[in-house]
Amino acid sequence: NFMYSKTVKRLSKLQEYQQYYPSLTCVMEGKDMEDWSCCPTPWTSFQSSCYFISTVMQSWTKSQNNCSVMGADLVVINTKEEQDFITQNLKINSAYFLGLSDPKGWRHWQWVDQTPYNKNVTFWHSGEPNSPDERCAIINFRSEEWGWNDVHCHVPQKSICKMKKIYI
């Protein structure tokens, strides 16, 4: 009976999400393997988040709007492990917008989800950021490593969206 009601609840939750995400990829987790964590297909998952790499070239504002329509934001990177996971799926000759910007050019960088900007957990390339005219951040491959660079926000780039996993 308990298992039946849990399955019914799951199915109704899945139906609810189906109007936003036609397909979900779920894995069982939790100590009793009773919880399912899901990401929209074909998003990838890492820890408690889902990631989508958009190859559509758009400005920073349009990239953020694009993520928003999918219930996500441009990616907020909190750890080196998270960055290492993300970069496994990136192309080394491309650049991708992050959810990091400095809209007033005061070098007050801010994350789209209001996560405090912590200078100790940043991965700027050497010498970056280097221009207050360049108010948006990308991640790209330079000098044999992935790192961040400040660029003009209106220049179209690829982008990375991030959302919380869906638990059912």
């Epitope: 349009k62 221009s131 108010r135």
Partner: antibody, heavy 121, light 111 residues
Framework: EVQLLESGGGLVQPGGSLRLSCAAS????????MSWVRQAPGKGLEWVAT????????YYPDSVKGRFTISRDNSKNTLYLQMNSLRAEDTAVYYC??????????????WGQGTTVTVSS | DIVMTQSPDSLAVSLGERATINCKAS??????????VNWYQQKPGQPPKLLIY???NLESGVPDRFSGSGSGTDFTLTISSLQAEDVAVYYC?????????FGGGTKVEIK
Amino acid sequence: EVQLLESGGGLVQPGGSLRLSCAASGITFSTYTMSWVRQAPGKGLEWVATINSGGDNTYYPDSVKGRFTISRDNSKNTLYLQMNSLRAEDTAVYYCATYRPYYYGSVLDYWGQGTTVTVSS
Amino acid sequence: DIVMTQSPDSLAVSLGERATINCKASQSVDYDGNSYVNWYQQKPGQPPKLLIYGASNLESGVPDRFSGSGSGTDFTLTISSLQAEDVAVYYCQQSDEDPWTFGGGTKVEIK
């Protein structure tokens, strides 16, 4: 007073090359992103190229990508536009302009008087 | 590319009267409460001059008879009381996404 003085325009044959210069004064040139904008005779305005203050990032529309190169020499307060493989449709007055950011966008706030490029055989 | 469509192509207005120029973007040029549209004035034989930025902000030194409004895809430049020195071509421009694109221009003349 901000002054931008373009030079280097002239008559060139199709397929030829030309290098435009823009000498800036009255601004701290090395801190400014700079752009080139052109205007064909009797026509509207078309953005041609942008370079950031350090000169390490350059941007072009598809119409000139691979043919035009924007560069700068901050020690000489001068902006350049190297134009190769010129076509008749590149005939225009070429203006250099200073770029001012506005949140996630920008404005072109100071403009030079322009230099005329004519591509014709 | 974002296409900026201006109307009318030309406009004849009596001195002291109001002139209104419209600009329509092919997609929204707004984000987070700001609109990325600028207006420029170009007099014969001169380079363009910035009048309005961010759809409605008057550039320093520009007379306050000029004003801008609009958001999303629809923008307007208004000259509240036309003066002889306002005879020019006016251009809108979007800076939301490269390539920056300009409207085709509106020629303002005195009736």
